[in-house]
């Protein structure tokens, strides 16, 4: 058993049929010695008396808010949560496996630039009685500071019969140099509590590996005389690291109709303009990627050919 | 310590092309190592990230773009002195700081070159003959060093009398390649910045 936060405790349980469970001793936070009784949740049934209460925690029915009273007055609370371990593996029931970039990916993180700011998100099908707490650091043995905000519900989607909820959090490394060469990864730890179930999820990464620039901005078309060719120009996204001559991007320019199966024109360039062939009912799209370290491509920025 | 926006002579900054080749060569070599040593811990997640130049050179700090010198987190106090001549200095107006940056890059390359050559000598003794260093990568390191053209004492190639542990050598190769790729990215960014200045 360990303390998650004040008056909230996590009991780690090996979860299998007829498991013996874990013996837990609760102590009432009071100077009083006599006349103390214990109850669980909203029940008025007295579980025991005395300053300490010993319980055998085996299942979710044994978890919950234990309260010690004296003469009708509440003295203190202890909330017990369960953390299940099945076949030596901690449970991951609360969050959905996003399976990208690999199986058992529960947290996904992206950064728009090298400033040390990044966003992580996760998915769940659970809609109520759900709380998240996020901590982060650079390295684990001698951790350097990363400050994370509160996790918020950022999107709701319908997937078949289920509703899916996306939560996200923004974090900022306390003293980040955009030009630095990372040797210690960022560690992100998410505590998830659903009703009386506790789970924790972690992700470890270098900012350089989670870079995904914003799409190029200000796409403009200029038809070339006596030609089917069009000059398309654009600018670096505002959120990209500066100077751009140091943090350079490379671009992919594509002309395509509405269907992915349609024919297309595609060209890669390090410049902020390119010449392509425009077709009726097609659109020109441009995306960006770090020129020197191939992490993710940005989303497409598009304009219609016409 | 930073790179002032110097005004090199018009035309291609002499080292930009070589640095692009360097990044390409080390990326290819790393990819080859990951594929060949698939049953060894050779991915970014599996290895320890070590920097053999730590406390010996200060390329990131010495080559910091002027725009980032206002960022407190970028200003590291490490002091290192370097020789200040070199043919990549495309203009007489080039500052002392730029010379410091380029000589730091030269020292990096020299250290990695020694490490890679020592390692290759060990890998050539491996009866499995599983992996060797790409000669092209070694040649590209050499070309960039020649383009930088700094005079400095030659570092003797390390020779080891004990029987090499090939497993350890291959893991060390992965560590070295990952670190060198990151440094090659920095070098490419620096050359691109200098070329644009």
């Amino acid at each position: 058993i360990w303390e998650l936060k004040k008056d909230v405790y996590v009991v780690e349980l090996d979860w299998y049929p007829d498991a013996p469970g874990e013996m837990v001793v609760l102590t009432c936070d009071t100077p009083e010695e006599d006349g103390i009784t214990w109850t669980l949740d909203q029940s008025s049934e007295v579980l025991g008396s005395g300053k300490t209460l010993t319980i055998q925690v085996k299942e979710f029915g044994d978890a919950g808010q234990y309260t010690c009273h004296k003469g009708g007055e509440v003295l203190s609370h202890s909330l017990l949560l369960l953390h299940k371990k099945e076949d030596g593996i901690w449970s991951t029931d609360i969050l959905k496996d996003q399976k990208e970039p690999k199986n058992k990916t529960f947290l996904r993180c992206e950064a728009k630039n090298y400033s040390g700011r990044f966003t992580c998100w996760w998915l769940t099908t659970i809609s109520t009685d759900l709380t998240f707490s996020v901590k982060s650091s650079r390295g684990s043995s001698d951790p350097q500071g990363v400050t994370c905000g509160a996790a918020t519900l950022s999107a709701e989607r319908v997937r078949g019969d289920n509703k899916e909820y996306e939560y996200s959090v923004e974090c900022q490394e306390d003293s980040a140099c955009p030009a630095a060469e990372e040797s210690l990864p960022i560690e992100v730890m998410v505590d998830a509590v659903h009703k009386l179930k506790y789970e924790n999820y972690t992700s470890s990464f270098f900012i350089r590996d989670i870079i995904k620039p914003d799409p190029p901005k200000n796409l403009q078309l200029k038809p070339l005389k006596n030609s089917r060719q069009v000059e398309v120009s654009w600018e670096y996204p505002d959120t990209w690291s500066t100077p751009h001559s140091y943090f350079s991007l490379t671009f992919c320019v594509q002309v395509q109709g509405k269907s992915k199966r349609e024919k297309k024109d595609r060209v890669f360039t390090d410049k902020t303009s390119a010449t392509v062939i425009c077709r009726k009912n097609a659109s020109i799209s441009v995306r960006a990627q770090d020129r020197y370290y191939s992490s993710s491509w940005s989303e497409w920025a598009s304009v219609p050919c016409s | 310590r930073n790179l002032p926006v110097a005004t090199p002579d018009p035309g291609m900054f002499p080292c930009l092309h070589h640095s692009q080749n360097l990044l390409r060569a080390v990326s290819n070599m790393l990819q080859k190592a990951r594929q060949t040593l698939e049953f060894y811990p050779c991915t970014s997640e599996e290895i320890d990230h070590e920097d053999i130049t730590k406390d010996k050179t200060s390329t990131v700090e010495a080559c910091l773009p002027l725009e980032l010198t206002k960022n407190e987190s970028c200003l590291n106090s490490r002091e290192t002195s370097f020789i200040t001549n070199g043919s990549c200095l495309a203009s007489r107006k080039t500052s002392f700081m730029m010379a410091l940056c380029l000589s730091s890059i030269y020292e990096d390359l020299k250290m990695y070159q020694v490490e890679f050559k020592t390692m290759n000598a060990k890998l050539l003794m491996d009866p499995k003959r599983q992996i060797f260093l790409d000669q092209n990568m070694l040649a590209v390191i050499d070309e960039l060093m020649q383009a930088l053209n700094f005079n400095s004492e030659t570092v003797p190639q390390k020779s080891s009398l004990e029987e090499p542990d090939f497993y350890k050598t291959k893991i060390k190769l992965c560590i070295l390649l990952h670190a060198f790729r990151i440094r090659a990215v920095t070098i490419d960014r620096v050359m691109s910045y200098l070329n644009a200045s």
């Epitope: 490379t250 199966r261 349609e262 024919k263 595609r266 890669f268 062939i277 077709r279 | -």
Partner: antibody, heavy 118, light 107 residues
Framework: QVQLVQSGAEVKKPGSSVKVSCKAS????????LHWVRQAPGQGLEWMGW????????EYAPKFQGRVTITADESTSTAYMELSSLRSEDTAVYLC???????????WGQGTLVTVSS | DIVMTQSPLSLPVTPGEPASISCRAS??????LHWYQQKPGQAPRLLIY???QSISGVPSRFSGSGSGTDFTLTISSLQPEDFATYYC?????????FGQGTKVEIK
């Protein structure tokens, strides 16, 4: 299976014209760009131009501009390349090629030898 | 027009040995570079597109690398059926242009 089948060899007099055909099978004809590339005996490859069979748009290499015409007939899934004012240096194997991507070629015809000789 | 220069023009190789062909562009073409194989009397066959992207059905011994102006086609271990002429082609701008070709011959 996508295939491009070209017309047979031709012998032409200098100053005349030649029209080579390229019939496509497998896949929808208008879903692909169609190019013509030539190869002189023992020489390399030389791109001549492309057509979008969907709308008849064409683009030609400056070297052949004014002498080459590429057309397409959607009803028969056939593309044509006509080269006029032939000279002896136009003796070559003419290849058609296609792709959903405009700028490179993933399926080629077998080639048509055009000999220009007086 | 962008001029593509291949080297060497002839490459004698022992079967089972690796082979590398170089292609240089007269100006930077990013990764807009494709490789073809051509055997006598046959049409070319696409091997690699956009400098390093492999084609399904093409043996994994063929790989491409490079960007900017310098590109390489590598055959890790030459098989008897790989003796042919190889061409690079740029697609950075029209007109599309090819290298002169490199003939890989049996040593």
């Amino acid at each position: 299976q996508v295939q491009l089948v070209q017309s047979g060899a031709e012998v032409k007099k200098p100053g005349s014209s030649v029209k080579v055909s390229c019939k496509a099978s497998g896949g929808t004809f208008s879903d692909y760009y169609l190019h013509w590339v030539r190869q002189a005996p023992g020489q390399g490859l030389e791109w001549m131009g492309w057509i979008d069979p969907e709308n008849g748009d064409t683009e030609y290499a400056p070297k052949f501009q004014g002498r080459v015409t590429i057309t397409a007939d959607e009803s028969t899934s056939t593309a044509y390349m006509e080269l006029s004012s032939l000279r002896s240096e136009d003796t070559a194997v003419y290849l058609c090629a296609r792709n959903k991507e405009l700028r490179y070629f993933d399926v080629w015809g077998q080639g048509t030898l055009v000999t220009v000789s007086s | 027009d962008i001029v593509m220069t291949q080297s060497p023009l002839s490459l004698p190789v022992t079967p089972g040995e690796p082979a590398s062909i170089s292609c240089r562009a007269s100006q930077s073409i990013s990764i807009n570079l494709h490789w073809y194989q051509q055997k006598p009397g046959q049409a070319p066959r696409l091997l690699i597109y956009f400098a390093s992207q492999s084609i399904s059905g093409v043996p994994s011994r063929f790989s491409g690398s490079g960007s900017g102006t310098d590109f390489t086609l590598t055959i890790s271990s030459l098989q008897p059926e790989d003796f042919a002429t190889y061409y690079c082609q740029q697609s950075n701008s029209f007109p599309l242009t090819f290298g002169q070709g490199t003939k890989v011959e049996i040593k």
